[in-house]
Amino acid sequence: LPRWRQQWSGSGTTSRFPETVLARCVKYTEVHPEMRHVDCQSVWDAFKGAFISKYPCNITEEDYQPLVKLGTQTVPCNKTLLWSRIKDLAHQFTQVQRDMFTLEDMLLGYLADDLTWCGEFNTFEINYQSCPDWRKDCSNNPVSVFWKTVSRRFAETACGVVHVMLNGSRSKIFDKNSTFGSVEVHNLQPEKVQALEAWVIHGGREDSRDLCQDPTIKELESIISKRNIRFFCKNIYRPDKFLQCVKNPEDSSCLSGI
């Protein structure tokens, strides 16, 4: 008889989760020479150990410590790109601008990007049926705690000028409740980070407003300035042109504003 299993409100663990994580790790270490020393079996053991056999509403950042330790990686100063509610464009940007890095360009972010996972208390099984939803069930679930943990570490280790891409089409361009607003902003280290530069991405082609004057951007500026980090803001009026100009900076049309 199938044993009783807790029903959560969120979707279950991504199909073939262990195989996916291991395969992503192998691929990543093959492509990134500085990570070739990483033992992907150990990385999977650490990932698994963070949530297997544990009640999935009682996961802590400490549970992920072995994984964070094994996946430690360095980002050069001035090369960190944070993002909020505009993941696809941020990733398109770093795919072109290969010397800049989002969290998902790092090993741990790459392993977990777009995946869901959870286990069950006192069994070694992975729950493929359902996992806790952040709102409806609990915030201390395996996926949410993972992203909070690695986002904190990513922000803590940033240095120089840090960039953040923000979605100008949202009602709250800067959202204090986003991972960027609740975790990353507060873990930038003033002794290492000289400035935060926000890129506000416009949605409409005819949108010529200065979204850097938006009240939520002013709120971000205030938070950052109070932490003794300088703040700059730029409007990206034409994201398509912006990407094109990153690819081909010599293009004559790129000499005018984007």
Partner: antibody, heavy 117, light 107 residues
Framework: QVQLQQSGAELVRPGTSVKMSCKAA????????IEWVKQRPGHGLEWIGD????????DYNEKFKGKATLTADTSSSTAYMQLSSLTSEDSAIYYC??????????WGQGTSVTVSS | DIQMNQSPSSLSASLGDTITITCHAS??????LGWYQQKPGNIPKLLIY???NLHTGVPSRFSGSGSGTGFTLTISSLQPEDIATYYC?????????FGGGTKLEIK
């Protein structure tokens, strides 16, 4: 082969500071954590903290925060530990070791610190 | 902090014997356990990492097992050069902690 060469023994006065070194060879220094461990007779082994030379990231045992400061110089593949406000309790052998799978796979020969007036 | 309770604290055995040292963690440490050998006047040396993996150059008479909270180090066919103190160490959470050590003597 992996080697960690530590600086020589130190005899220091109470209240002063000491800085010891750990020079790595035989592997990519920036890719592995360097662990620091204290050993006193009858007290076993105590983990002080570690540093990831590639980014200068550090983690400390709460007990040694304010006592130990870990740094690294990637140009010379050398890790350093400074101990401040020394007392007789700090008399010990201090080891550096390379981190591997959350264990310590290669150890330096140790630096003996004696605090005495 | 995670406590690592090692037993016995001392052990006397004959050459050729098989001996077992145990290490109990005060909370789950998964497989993140290392075993070290320290001969008198020498530096600690890694024997086993990740609970059961033999470190490079370590004789196969050393073996490790366990996961979660209970771990064992087994030395089969005891040799004179095995006289040493053995330590376990957890790497699951900060601060990393060591067991109190097991001093092995030959009868």
């Amino acid at each position: 082969q992996v080697q960690l060469q530590q600086s020589g023994a130190e005899l220091v006065r109470p209240g002063t500071s000491v800085k010891m070194s750990c020079k790595a060879a035989g592997y990519t220094f920036t890719n592995h954590w360097i662990e620091w461990v204290k050993q006193r007779p009858g007290h076993g082994l105590e983990w002080i903290g570690d540093i990831f030379p590639g980014g200068g990231y550090t983690d400390y045992n709460e007990k040694f925060k304010g006592k130990a400061t870990l740094t690294a110089d990637t140009s010379s593949s050398t890790a350093y530990m400074q101990l401040s406000s020394l007392t007789s309790e700090d008399s010990a052998i201090y080891y550096c070791a390379r981190g591997r799978d959350l264990a310590m796979d290669y150890w330096g020969q140790g630096t003996s610190v004696t605090v005495s007036s | 902090d995670i406590q690592m309770n090692q037993s016995p604290s001392s052990l006397s055995a004959s050459l050729g014997d098989t001996i077992t040292i145990t290490c109990h963690a005060s909370q789950n440490i998964n497989v993140w356990l290392g075993w070290y050998q320290q001969k008198p006047g020498n530096i600690p040396k890694l024997l086993i990492y990740k609970a059961s993996n033999l470190h490079t150059g370590v004789p196969s008479r050393f073996s490790g097992s366990g996961s979660g909270t209970g771990f064992t180090l087994t030395i089969s066919s005891l040799q004179p050069e095995d006289i040493a103190t053995y330590y376990c160490q957890q790497g699951q959470s900060y601060p990393y902690t060591f067991g109190g050590g097991t001093k092995l003597e030959i009868k």
